[in-house]
Interface confidence: low
């Protein structure tokens, strides 16, 4: 039959070359004369003249060594043809098929590979896949297929075998627990791949294995017993810097300590922070200190760290022993700020109150007292019993000194330690209003006409409070009722001035008196203008010479 | 201040042995990895030798089996013991602070280093 | 080993002019899991110790005047002296730390043209 099967040809024959394949025969060769070519890539076409035919017997021939990694199956057609050139068959398929030699050694992708892991992880913990590729045949032989091998671990330490890998995907794991960071941060493992499955040729790569920071190591302070020297009622003072030492990473959350007062601090006296750089914990005073209260405080404070601990650590503990100082504390007026009420003006040298201060000091200090700022210069102050006096005139309505009706002083206490300290205190008088002031018109000058004059609108003010103010009432005194009528509009506390007879253009007095609900009464003299002109005028036409 | 003082160079014949020192002050040697490296006279630099914070150790393939790298901690002092001295030996001897422990410190590379000392081996 | 090359071996440059030093390795320096290239720059002058001036390639050491950059990823490095001055006269190595054994490379010498 015109028909040849799969033809098998090693890769890098040794020839000799053409060596014979396979011969192609047709069983038309009885009747005629038979003439055979090939044609295909390999053959005709790229690459050229690997394959030949004998024209007249048919044998197939290989021209040169193959290289299955190049080409591994030719695909060419056999033709027959009769002497006067008709073909005789049908096209004929020819599969040659390279078969493979182990010519290729493996290849790793990379000349150094990285990988990390935890420290302290348990065996079978992957890290890192390795590859190497080779070119020969994998699937009909063992010629390219890779085992994976460990040759050496650099540093040795716990010891040799630290890590395995897998022969057939190249995975790298630990293989024994004692990965520790803080002896051994880094792996250099030499490994190997090697062809036929581990029989044959072999090239090596570097795996690089950093060994990650895991927060085995707890802090331990170093001392753990601290005394410290505080002086009393000093917030935010530095109290003592605790050390601890921790053999994880440095400035990494498993270094980082996390400090707590775990006892001795009930009145919550004490606070505690870490430093950025240092890692020490900083003892700080959040309130001040009482000596006279305490004068002993014993702290204990833990330490941990930022991240959780992977195992059971024991938690160190330090304890630091305070001893406040005794300071000479000023005193301190009881209550800090005092209000006292008063009536105004009351006379000179009148007691208004007694303010005296309290010394937090144990021995029995003597205080003497005296007025610090007094703007007025209203009060006095006995030095030895702290007494308050008149000493001015209190003006409720002296609005330079006084506001709502408060007088604000500032007052000194001084004791007699070594050195002495001040304390002050403050005094606000509340000034009870008396009826000091009569009621007052604005303004005082007015602009009227002599013929159908408008009337004048003034208003009543009256420093006093009330009751001590409206109602009010007017009356016009000194024969100022001949010309003028006055009269109060209780509404809008004003009083309306009128013309009431005809008076020629001149300026008058019109003398006025307000009185208050209390009856106090303030005479005032209004400057009436009164010009020749009809109704309404703000100033006496042209010409006027005035007397 | 970090300084590091190398000592301990000198004139040895080949195959004899010497021992450098290094000693460091203004950071506590075993918080840091610690290199040797070298420089033959008018060539570059070659890394020699590391030792790890925890001890472990690496070197480089060309001293690997003659060198050994040490420290002593209560005397803040590293060691680089030499055995079988050889001519191509000959440099200038560096001891170099790694950057930090830590590989994210950059630890590879190295911030402060010794003004060095020569080591001579010829016979 | 990792195989550092720099170029030029040397090269001589006016004060105030820009400078830039090549450096190739042999492998990529870049460590895909944390996105850094382990590479640093030393400069080394006459009869001193080296001076780390730039690490992950591109991060000055502190105290290291901002117109020494460096630059490059994977397997291409650069260091660039912006404004070149008489002081900068030196040798200057890269340096892999990305595997055992660290490596440098033969060294660049810059002189004043």
């Known amino acids: 039959d015109w028909v040849v099967a799969p033809i098998s040809v090693p890769e890098n024959g040794k020839g000799p070359f053409p060596q014979r394949l396979n011969q192609l025969k047709s069983n038309k060769d009885r009747d005629t004369k038979i003439f055979y070519s090939i044609t295909g890539p390999g053959a005709d076409s790229p690459p050229e003249g690997v394959f030949a035919v004998e024209k007249e017997t048919g044998w197939l021939l290989l021209n040169k060594p193959l290289d299955r990694e190049e080409i591994a199956k030719y695909e060419l057609f056999g033709h027959a043809v009769s002497e006067n050139g008709a073909s005789v068959e049908d096209p004929m398929n020819i599969s040659i098929i390279v078969t493979d030699q182990n010519d290729h050694k493996p290849k790793f992708t990379q000349d150094t590979f990285r990988g990390s892991v935890l420290e302290g992880v348990l065996p079978g913990t992957s890290v890192m896949q390795v590859t190497a590729t080779d070119e020969d045949d994998a699937i009909h032989t063992y010629n390219g297929v890779v085992a994976y091998s460990i040759h050496s671990q650099e540093p040795k330490d716990p010891h040799d075998l630290m890590f395995t890998i897998h022969r057939s995907t190249g995975t790298i794991s630990v293989i024994s627990s004692g990965l520790d960071r803080e002896k051994v941060p880094e792996y250099t493992l030499t490994i190997q791949a090697t062809d036929m499955d581990g029989d044959g040729s072999t090239t090596t790569a570097v795996a690089v294995v950093e060994i990650l920071d895991a927060n085995d190591n707890a802090p331990v302070f170093d001392p753990q017993k601290y005394e410290s020297h505080v002086p009393e009622n000093a917030v935010g003072h530095e109290v003592q810097r605790l050390t601890v030492t921790d053999l994880d990473a440095p400035n990494s959350p498993a270094w980082r300590a996390t400090y707590l007062i775990v006892g001795g601090d009930d009145g919550d006296h004490f606070t505690i922070a870490t430093h950025p750089e240092s890692n020490q914990g900083i003892l700080t005073t959040r309130k001040g200190l009482d000596f006279e209260a305490k004068n002993q405080h014993t702290l204990y404070v833990e330490v941990t760290n930022e991240a959780p601990f992977v195992l059971k650590l024991p938690t160190s503990t330090a304890t630091i022993v305070v001893h406040v100082e005794d300071v000479n504390e000023a005193p301190v007026f009881v209550p800090p700020s005092k209000v006292v009420e008063v009536q105004e003006g009351i006379p000179t040298g009148e007691a208004v109150c007694v303010y005296t201060a309290k010394d937090p000091d144990k021995e029995n200090q003597k205080i003497s007292y005296r007025i610090l700022r007094d703007p007025a210069g209203w009060l006095a102050m006995d030095p030895d019993s702290g007494q308050v006096t008149v000493a001015g005139t209190l003006d409720r309505e002296d609005e330079r000194f006084v506001r709502n009706n408060i007088y604000e002083v500032m007052v000194l206490a001084v004791d007699n330690g070594s050195p002495p300290t001040t304390g002050t205190g403050t005094l606000l008088l509340t000034l009870i209003d008396v009826n000091d002031h009569g009621p007052v018109p604005e303004p005082r000058e007015i602009t009227i006409c002599n013929q159908s004059p408008e009337s004048q609108v003034l208003n009543i003010t009256d420093k006093d409070l009330s009751p001590h103010t409206s109602p009010f009432q007017a009356q016009l005194t000194d024969d100022s009722d001949i010309y003028w009528m006055a009269e109060v509009n209780e509404k809008d506390d004003t009083v309306v001035l009128s013309l009431k007879k005809f008076l020629k253009q001149d300026t008058y007095d019109v003398h006025l008196s307000l009185s208050d609900h209390g009856n106090k009464e303030q005479l005032t003299v209004i400057r009436a203008t009164v010009c020749d002109c009809h109704g309404h005028v703000e100033k006496c036409p042209d010409p006027w010479k005035g007397g | 201040e970090v300084q590091l003082l190398e000592s301990g160079g000198g004139l040895v014949q080949p195959g004899g042995s010497l021992r450098l020192s290094c000693a460091v002050s203004?950071?506590?040697?075993?918080?840091?990895?610690i290199n040797w490296v070298r420089q033959a006279p008018g060539k570059g630099l070659e890394w020699v030798s590391v030792i790890w914070t925890g001890g472990g150790t690496n070197y480089a393939s060309s001293v690997k089996g003659r060198f050994t790298i040490s420290r002593d901690n209560s005397k803040n002092t590293l060691y680089l013991q030499m055995n079988s001295l050889r001519a191509e030996d000959t440099a200038v001897y560096y001891c170099a602070k790694s950057r930090g422990v830590y590989d994210f410190d950059g630890r590879g590379a190295m911030d402060y280093w010794g003004q060095g000392t020569l080591v001579t081996v010829s016979s | 080993d990792i195989v550092m090359t720099q170029s030029p071996d040397s090269l001589a440059v006016s004060v105030g002019e820009r400078v830039t030093i090549n450096c190739k390795s042999s492998q990529s320096l870049l460590y895909s899991s944390n996105q850094k290239n382990y590479l640093a720059w030393y400069q080394q002058k006459p009869g001193q110790p080296p001076k780390l001036l730039i690490y992950w390639a591109s991060t000055r050491e502190s105290g290291v005047p901002d117109r020494f950059s460096g630059s490059g990823s994977g397997t291409d490095f650069t260091l660039t002296i912006s404004s070149l001055q008489a002081e900068d006269v030196a040798v200057y190595y890269c340096q892999q730390y990305y595997s055992y054994p660290y490596t440098f490379g033969q060294g660049t010498k810059l002189e004043i043209k």
């Open positions: 203004g950071f506590t040697l075993s918080s840091y990895p």
